[in-house]
Interface confidence: low
């Protein structure tokens, strides 16, 4: 680190005095200080001498000596006061430019350290500082306004009390620039627009920025529109608004509209689409299949997408049967608006009961007329099975009835012993009935099928079981012939004697 002689941090001299500052280092050294007249510089390798024979108040300042070859970049400094009774201030710059929230140093250097107790900062013409101006003072550097604000862009003077009167410095202009974080913020309203030919329309493109220097324009299909610009300033931001008013829209007004704003930081753009139609429209659609199958006891949400202009004048969900005249509860229906012209309507059907199968219709109306979308809801049921012994055309026959949805498949099993369900070890024979007779197959109802098993001789120490299954589940019924007659055994029930 270089060494300065005299080896004091501060030196106070009178105007006209001779001042010699010597800096010595291991290698070559350099002086750096405020720009001021009358200094002479002598260098001889590892030492450098800064001297003046006629010090003035303008020589007041901090002089720093550095050793460029020092990898640690060490330096030494001495502060010189040239104590001029007529000039308490040495102003190093008359204009200071900072960005908002930076500290602004107003470089008025006190020429006499004794005056420090009576210094203050004022605006020109003796006006006081603005409220909330937070500042500090250093006799070596001047006044610092902390976290400067745009509104503090003013002309300032440094004041010192000398012999009971205030002596002002020349003025310093502070320019606090707003930090431009990026291109202007944009809004384009509406985000989408539909109008019938001949109707009026309005599109508003607005941009805002902390700085006034920005441009905004609205373009239609890449053609710039000549629209008068309204300007405003609020919430500490400059606003520029372009409003496109169309009294009677036609098809040539349709297309893509882009709102574009730019400043020196770059640009932002946002777009919207304007659709011009010949007449009102109302379109209903669903992403779901209109034919729904759900297991009884489960829940289902039916969703309809509506695209309409003008807006809906009415809508509702209706149950069209066939089981009852009940109507969906309003609390189970809700609507969500995706955007101005598209809506989603949902009907929630929790824990479906057998009587809730059937047709559900969503109806909507606007000036374009009525539209409806109908869902068909069929409930799935696991099979229910029953077996009886009867004679058909003189032959002993086991008759199995199975009811469920989808249509059940039927399998007959013959097994040894008396049991409520044949297990693998007991099975003697298995017959699949590929074509059971369909007894009933009404829409939205269970399908009932019947399967016949002709048995010439009933084996008394055996069980005959009818099993039915579909995609939902399975059911079975065991038939046990005993000497007293034929006995049937539904699952999970006690044996009974007819």
């Amino acid at each position: 680190i270089p060494v300065i002689e005299p080896s004091v941090p501060e030196l106070v001299v009178k105007p006209g005095a001779t001042v010699t500052l010597r800096c010595v280092g291991n290698g070559s050294v350099e002086w750096d200080g405020p720009p001021s007249p009358h200094w002479t510089l002598y260098s001889d390798g590892s030492s450098s001498i800064l001297s003046t024979n006629n010090a003035t108040f303008q020589n007041t300042g901090t002089y720093r000596c550095t050793e460029p070859g020092d990898p640690l970049g060490g330096s030494a400094a001495i502060h010189l006061y040239v104590k001029d009774p007529a000039r308490p201030w040495n102003v190093l710059a008359q204009e200071v430019v900072v960005f908002e929230d930076q500290d602004a140093l107003l470089p008025c250097l006190l020429t006499d350290p004794v005056l420090e107790a009576g210094v203050s900062l004022v605006r020109v013409r003796g006006r006081p500082l603005m409220r909330h101006t937070n500042y500090s003072f250093s006799p070596w550097h001047g006044f610092t306004i902390h976290r400067a604000k745009f509104i503090q862009s003013q002309d300032y003077q440094c004041s010192a009390l000398m012999g009971g009167r205030k002596v002002m410095s020349i003025s310093i202009r502070l320019k606090v620039q707003k930090v431009i974080p990026g291109p202007p913020a944009l809004t384009l309203v509406p985000a989408e627009l539909v109008r019938i030919r001949g109707e009026a329309a309005q599109i508003v493109c607005s941009a805002s920025s902390v700085d006034v220097n920005f441009d905004v324009f609205l373009q239609h299909n890449n053609t710039k529109l000549a629209i008068p610009q309204q300007s405003d300033f609020h919430n500490n931001r400059y606003q520029k608004v372009l409003t496109l008013n169309l009294d009677q829209v036609d098809f040539q007004h349709a297309g893509n509209y882009s709102c574009v704003a730019s400043n020196v930081q770059g640009k932002h753009s946002t777009s919207m689409f304007f659709r011009v139609v010949e007449s009102a429209y109302l379109n209903l659609s669903s992403e779901q299949n209109l034919i729904q199958e759900v297991t009884v006891g489960e829940g289902l949400n039916l969703k309809v997408m509506v695209e309409a202009y003008p807006g809906l004048q009415g809508f509702n969900w209706t149950y069209l049967g066939p089981f009852s005249d009940h109507q969906p509860e309003p609390k189970l229906a809700n609507a969500t608006t995706k955007d101005t012209y598209r809506h989603t309507f949902t009907l929630s059907l929790p824990r479906l009961k057998p009587s809730e199968a059937g047709r559900y219709s969503f109806l909507a109306r606007n000036p374009g007329g009525w539209r409806a979308l109908t869902f068909e809801l069929t409930l799935r049921y696991p099979p229910e099975v029953s077996v009886i012994w009867t004679f058909i055309n003189g032959s002993g026959t086991l008759l199995c009835a199975a009811s469920g949805y989808p249509q059940p498949n039927v399998t007959w099993l013959q097994c040894s012993g008396h049991t409520d369900r044949c297990d693998e070890a007991q099975v003697l024979q298995v017959w699949d009935d590929p074509y059971p007779e369909v007894l009933s197959q009404e829409p939205f109802h269970k399908v009932t099928v019947q399967s016949l098993l002709t048995v010439e001789t009933l084996e008394h120490n055996q069980t005959y079981e009818c099993r039915a299954h579909n995609s939902v589940g399975s059911g079975s019924w065991a038939f046990i012939p005993i000497s007293a007659g034929a006995h049937t055994h539904p699952p999970d029930e006690f044996l009974f004697t007819p």
Partner: antibody
């Protein structure tokens, strides 16, 4: 037809000055930021300066800051670049280019050659 | 400033070849604000692609752009005789606008 036509190039000595013009036609001039881009002989493209549509904002590359001044006269549909304190390294073809505000420079002039030599 | 580095600096290809040029940015390019230009000797540059992948009106569909962040690509799906030129990438946010050093596509 949308067009930009540069003029004003020529031979000038180091330290000298020159004023380039860029005449626009076929579009609403005041609605577009316009840039100057240059290309030294056999080299790549170098962005120089930009001025916003109404002339309220200007910006310069560090290599020309303090020496070049961009301006525009929207009543004449003309862009200008004042070149002062010219150096040999400023020798280039200077192009003006239109910024549509939505990406890239979509219209370029044919360029004008500035040669700085003693 | 954002520096753009193109690779390769030059390439030789034949008519019908698929050609890919890459452009790498020293820091992320905001919102894909990157353009590609074609320049033929003695002519002004011509805009091909903007916003990294949007094809400028009138540019043949064999040109395509892709990428985001710091890595971008220009692809010519089937090189035509009129495509032999120098190609530049350019970022246009923020100022200063900067260009890549260029990629010269020559006839093999």
């Amino acid at each position: 037809e949308v067009q930009l036509v540069e003029s004003g190039g020529g031979l000038v000595q180091p330290g000298g000055s020159l004023r380039l013009s860029c005449a626009a036609s076929g579009f609403t001039f005041s609605g577009y930021a316009i840039h100057w881009v240059r290309q030294a002989p056999g080299k790549g493209l170098e962005w120089v300066s930009v001025i916003s549509g109404y002339g309220s904002s200007t910006y310069y590359a560090d290599s020309v800051k303090g020496r070049f001044t961009i301006s525009r006269d929207n009543s004449k549909n003309t862009l200008y670049l004042q070149l002062n304190s010219l150096r040999a390294e400023d020798t280039a073809v200077y192009y003006c280019a239109r910024d549509p505000g939505v990406g890239g420079f979509d219209v370029w002039g044919q360029g004008t050659l500035v040669t700085v030599s003693s | 400033d954002i520096q753009l580095t193109q690779s390769p600096s030059s390439l030789s290809a034949s008519v019908g070849d698929r050609v890919t040029i890459t452009c790498r940015a020293s820091q992320s390019v905001r919102r894909r604000f990157l353009a590609w230009y074609q320049q033929k000797p003695g002519k002004a540059p011509k805009l091909l692609i903007y916003d990294a992948s949007s094809l400028e009106s009138g540019v043949p569909s064999r040109f395509s752009g892709s990428g985001s962040g710091t890595d971008f690509t220009l692809t010519i799906s089937s090189l035509q005789p009129e495509d032999f030129a120098t190609y530049y990438c350019q970022q246009y946010y923020p100022i200063p606008r900067t260009f890549g050093q260029g990629t010269k596509v020559e006839i093999k």
